[in-house]
Interface confidence: low
């Protein structure tokens, strides 16, 4: 079942998703989509990375972390009630049916008072590939022996410390972690 994350209207929402490249630069394609993860790919793609870069993104959707180190957590800027719903983070591991799929439920609450649209304090550039703020690591590891030996050591959906402290009380921690190889 999906983990639930919350934000208020006008704030930035944060949906954590991590994998750890076995080595720098050895990236795995990732897609984010609106709606639960389908059998293949992502539906209603809002952002996509390839082996080197963020190659597709839509307005208001950003990677605010070090995606080159596997922090592919999604930030949705200035959310509205329409942003509520399930989001899919899909780590597209090479091989047949090897993808890791994470469904994250975003609940948008009406603002107590209507705030002016705000940006997170570390929102430092106009393009996601230039944003390099770090997160922190997973809480536990679960070993899987049946996956292929690829250059990828860990995948996790972990509620990292938020860059935006206003959301901190609304975020529920998740410790789902997968180690490969």
């Amino acid at each position: 079942s999906e983990v639930e994350y919350r934000a208020e209207v006008g704030q930035n929402a944060y949906l954590p998703c991590f994998y750890t490249p076995a080595a720098p630069g050895n990236l795995v394609p990732v897609c984010w989509g609106k709606g639960a993860c389908p059998v293949f790919e992502c539906g209603n793609v809002v952002l996509r990375t390839d082996e080197r870069d963020v190659n597709y993104w839509t307005s208001r959707y950003w990677l605010n972390g070090d995606f080159r180190k596997g922090d592919v957590s999604l930030t949705i800027e200035n959310v509205t009630l329409a942003d509520s719903g399930i989001y899919c983070c899909r780590i597209q591991i090479p091989g047949i049916m090897n993808d890791e799929k994470f469904n994250l439920k975003l609940v948008i609450k009406p603002a107590k008072v209507t705030p002016a649209p705000t940006r997170q304090r570390d929102f430092t550039a106009a393009f996601p590939r230039m944003l390099t703020t770090r997160g922190h690591g997973p809480a536990e590891t679960q070993t899987l022996g049946s996956l292929p030996d690829i250059n990828l050591t860990q995948i996790s959906t972990l509620a990292n410390e938020l860059r935006d402290s206003r959301l901190a009380n609304d975020l529920r921690d998740s410790g789902a972690t997968i180690r490969i190889g």
Epitope: T20, A23, K69, G135, G137, T153
Partner: antibody, heavy 125, light 108 residues
Framework: EVQLQQSGPVLVKPGTSVKMSCKAS????????LNWVKQSHGKSLEWIGV????????TYNPKFKGKATLTVDKSSSTAYMELNSLTSEDSAVYYC??????????????????WGQGTSVTVSS | DVVLTQSPATLSVTPGDSVSLSCRAS??????LHWYQQKSHESPRLLIK???QSISGIPSRFSGSGSGTDFTLSINSVETEDFGMYFC??????????FGGGTKLEIK
């Protein structure tokens, strides 16, 4: 000031194991990958492997798979390398070295900007 | 594996000379080539990263150039403190960083 302080020299017998340490200071330990590099006497450098202190993820040079095991202790900002089944071929100086934290879509590789002072391992009966 | 060949193996120079050290890769490594200096009984020190990018604290007389398979480290007006070993390293090929065999810069 960034520093990597390695444990002292060791003399060990063939067939045994040794575990050396690399204590990091002066930066956020989990923000940089840590490499281990071997330098045999009078020879060039060999990359052993890299560990991500963020979560313990590792990648090894195939030559050193099964020979070296890399771990970290985040609470003490210390990285460790254990070498097993030691032979005279393992006699060398071993360095830990921090990856340059450099992000730009033009580059995929990393350099090593800070190095420990090295740990000398001598394997002899 | 990517093999890095450094030449010459030994370079004898007089302080004040300008020198070039070569590093050739067995296949293209883009700009993922780095240079290190190692003095006797010391740890390696990063001089140049990504072919030509300078490193804070490294004298400006050190510079790098090249791309693909052929790379050069240049030292403009060698000083006595520059003598030692120089290694190139590639980080384009995973899961293996590789180093060149080294060039020894010695006083003539």
């Amino acid at each position: 000031e960034v520093q990597l302080q390695q444990s002292g020299p060791v003399l060990v017998k063939p067939g045994t194991s040794v575990k050396m340490s690399c204590k990091a200071s002066g930066y956020t330990f989990t923000d940089y990958y840590l490499n281990w590099v071997k330098q045999s006497h009078g020879k060039s450098l060999e990359w052993i492997g890299v560990i991500n202190p963020y979560n313990g993820g590792t990648t090894y040079n195939p030559k050193f798979k099964g020979k070296a095991t890399l771990t970290v202790d985040k609470s003490s900002s210390t990285a460790y390398m254990e070498l097993n089944s030691l032979t005279s071929e393992d006699s060398a100086v071993y360095y830990c070295a921090r990856d340059v934290d450099y992000f730009d879509n033009k580059y995929v590789g990393y350099a090593m900007d800070y190095w420990g002072q090295g740990t000398s391992v001598t394997v002899s009966s | 594996d990517v093999v890095l060949t450094q030449s010459p193996a030994t370079l004898s120079v007089t302080p004040g000379d300008s020198v070039s050290l070569s590093c050739r890769a067995s296949q293209s490594i883009s700009n993922n080539l780095h240079w290190y200096q190692q003095k006797s009984h010391e740890s390696p020190r990063l001089l140049i990263k990504y072919t030509s990018q300078s490193i804070s604290g490294i004298p400006s007389r050190f510079s790098g150039s090249g791309s693909g398979t052929d790379f050069t480290l240049s030292i403009n007006s060698v000083e006595t403190e520059d003598f030692g070993m120089y290694f190139c390293q590639q980080s384009n090929s995973w899961p293996q960083y590789t180093f060149g065999g080294g060039t020894k810069l010695e006083i003539k």
